[in-house]
């Protein structure tokens, strides 16, 4: 708290301008009218106020708006946004995408802070869903944003928003998240032709079921090994050697380098060694000739 002291003669601020950087904290408190500050918030960012001076300006706004700032002030907070706590932000009602952009710009190039996370949460909840424009904005500032959401939160993403997603936006997503996003992507891109469809759907394939992988294997897609290694193990296991060969095309040779890693390792264990030998890659660990494979999970389901 800054002590209440009278403003020295001749120092009363008539406007928010650069001369205020020379004011001590107590002078800012005494000489800057909160209502003037609120109406000229757009000027604050143009002036190099220090950490301590911004504290005083925030205190003045807090006194003027104890129930939370209006959006007209929020939009022009600039670096003053960095002084806000998540508790402050929870009092706000931010509806404009322009306001969101203005505040994200302040923290650009830095990792997502609790303030930013709270702001985004308030904004998205206010909109009811993560629409395309919002998703576009958020992933532009924070490429990993999508993967920071829970599967439950991702379920509110409409398929139309999937068009805004870039491959790098999914880099840190786990299989549970891709399970939610893949069906939305499949729906969003369903009217595209084969090769274009594969380019768009490729980043989401970590959530694809076996039957979709089987279908892709019939389309000469030449999936690269990096994508194959991100597929769900349970989706890869039922694929035949022929299907994997068709799915990977010329990239099938890469299986040898990955034979000790999932899902390739587990897939090899499920294939007949004879079939693996047809690839000519020297893959070992398949089921020897003459052995009978019992699918115990199927047996349990029947009993």
């Amino acid at each position: 708290e800054v002590e209440k002291t009278a403003c020295p003669s001749g120092k009363k601020a008539r406007e928010i301008d650069e001369s205020l950087i020379f004011y001590k904290k107590w002078e800012l408190e005494a000489c800057v009218d909160a209502a003037l500050l609120a109406t000229q918030m757009d000027r604050v960012n143009a002036i190099p106020f220090t950490y301590e001076q911004l504290d005083v300006l925030k205190h003045k706004l807090d006194e003027l708006y104890p129930q939370g700032y209006p959006e007209s002030v929020i939009q022009h907070l600039g670096y003053l946004f960095l002084k806000m706590s998540p508790e402050d932000i929870r009092k706000w009602n931010v509806t404009s995408l322009e306001t969101l952009k203005a505040l994200l710009e302040v923290n650009k190039g830095h990792e997502m802070s609790p303030q930013v996370a709270t702001l985004i949460d308030r904004f998205v909840k206010g909109r009811g869903q993560l629409d395309k424009d919002t998703l576009d904005t958020l992933t532009a500032f924070y490429p990993g944003y999508l993967c920071s959401l829970s599967p439950e939160e991702l379920s509110s993403v409409p398929p139309s928003s999937i068009w805004a997603v870039r491959p790098q936006d999914l880099d840190t997503c786990d299989p549970r998240q891709l399970d939610v996003l893949y069906p939305k992507a499949r729906l969003a891109f369903q009217n595209m032709n084969g090769s274009e469809y594969f380019v768009k759907i490729q980043s989401f394939l970590g959530g694809a079921p076996t039957e979709d992988l089987k279908a892709l294997s019939q389309q000469n897609v030449s999936m690269d090994l990096a994508t194959f290694m991100k597929l769900r193990t349970d989706a890869v296991l039922p694929l035949t050697v022929a299907e994997v060969q068709k799915l990977l095309g010329p990239h099938v040779e890469g299986l040898k380098a990955e034979e000790r890693h999932r899902p390739v390792r587990d897939w090899i264990l499920r294939q007949r060694q004879d079939d693996l030998d047809t690839l000519g890659l020297g893959l070992q660990g398949g089921i020897p000739n003459g052995y009978l494979v019992l699918d115990l999970s199927m047996q349990e389901a029947l009993s």
Epitope: N45, P48, Y79, L82
Partner: nanobody
Framework: QVQLVESGGGLVQPGGSLRLSCAAS????????VAWYRQAPGEQREPVAA???????IYADSVKGRFTISRDNAKNTVYLQMSSLKPEDTAVYYC??????????WGQGTSVTVSP
């Protein structure tokens, strides 16, 4: 993280000149308001010169007419040209602006000593 590197300080006689430079990582100085500050031994850090994001400049009364703040956006560098230096200008000089200023991150500063 933003990095601020001030340089150009040194020992100079009264009446002499120095040109301080401050380089920042990223495009911080090309888009933000910036300022030079100084801290004399046993004193608080105080602003001496500032430039708004619009380019207008302002100076502390004690340095008006002697110091000039400028910036080169292409080099992402801010300068402080100091002339007619006085012993009372002796201090460590810092520059700052934008995100790092709001977050209270500072460089190491550059020391200026004005002595006969």
């Amino acid at each position: 993280q933003v990095q601020l590197v001030e340089s150009g300080g040194g020992l100079v006689q009264p009446g002499g000149s120095l040109r301080l430079s401050c380089a920042a990582s990223g495009s911080m100085f090309s888009i933000n308001a910036v300022a030079w500050y100084r801290q004399a031994p046993g004193e608080q850090r105080e602003p001496v010169a500032a430039m708004t994001s619009g380019g207008s400049t302002i100076y502390a009364d004690s340095v008006k007419g002697r110091f000039t703040i400028s910036r080169d956006n292409a080099k992402n560098t801010v300068y402080l040209q100091m002339s007619s230096l006085k012993p009372e200008d002796t201090a460590v000089y810092y520059c700052n602006g934008g995100w790092s200023l709001a977050m209270d991150y500072w460089g190491q500063g550059t020391s200026v000593t004005v002595s006969p």
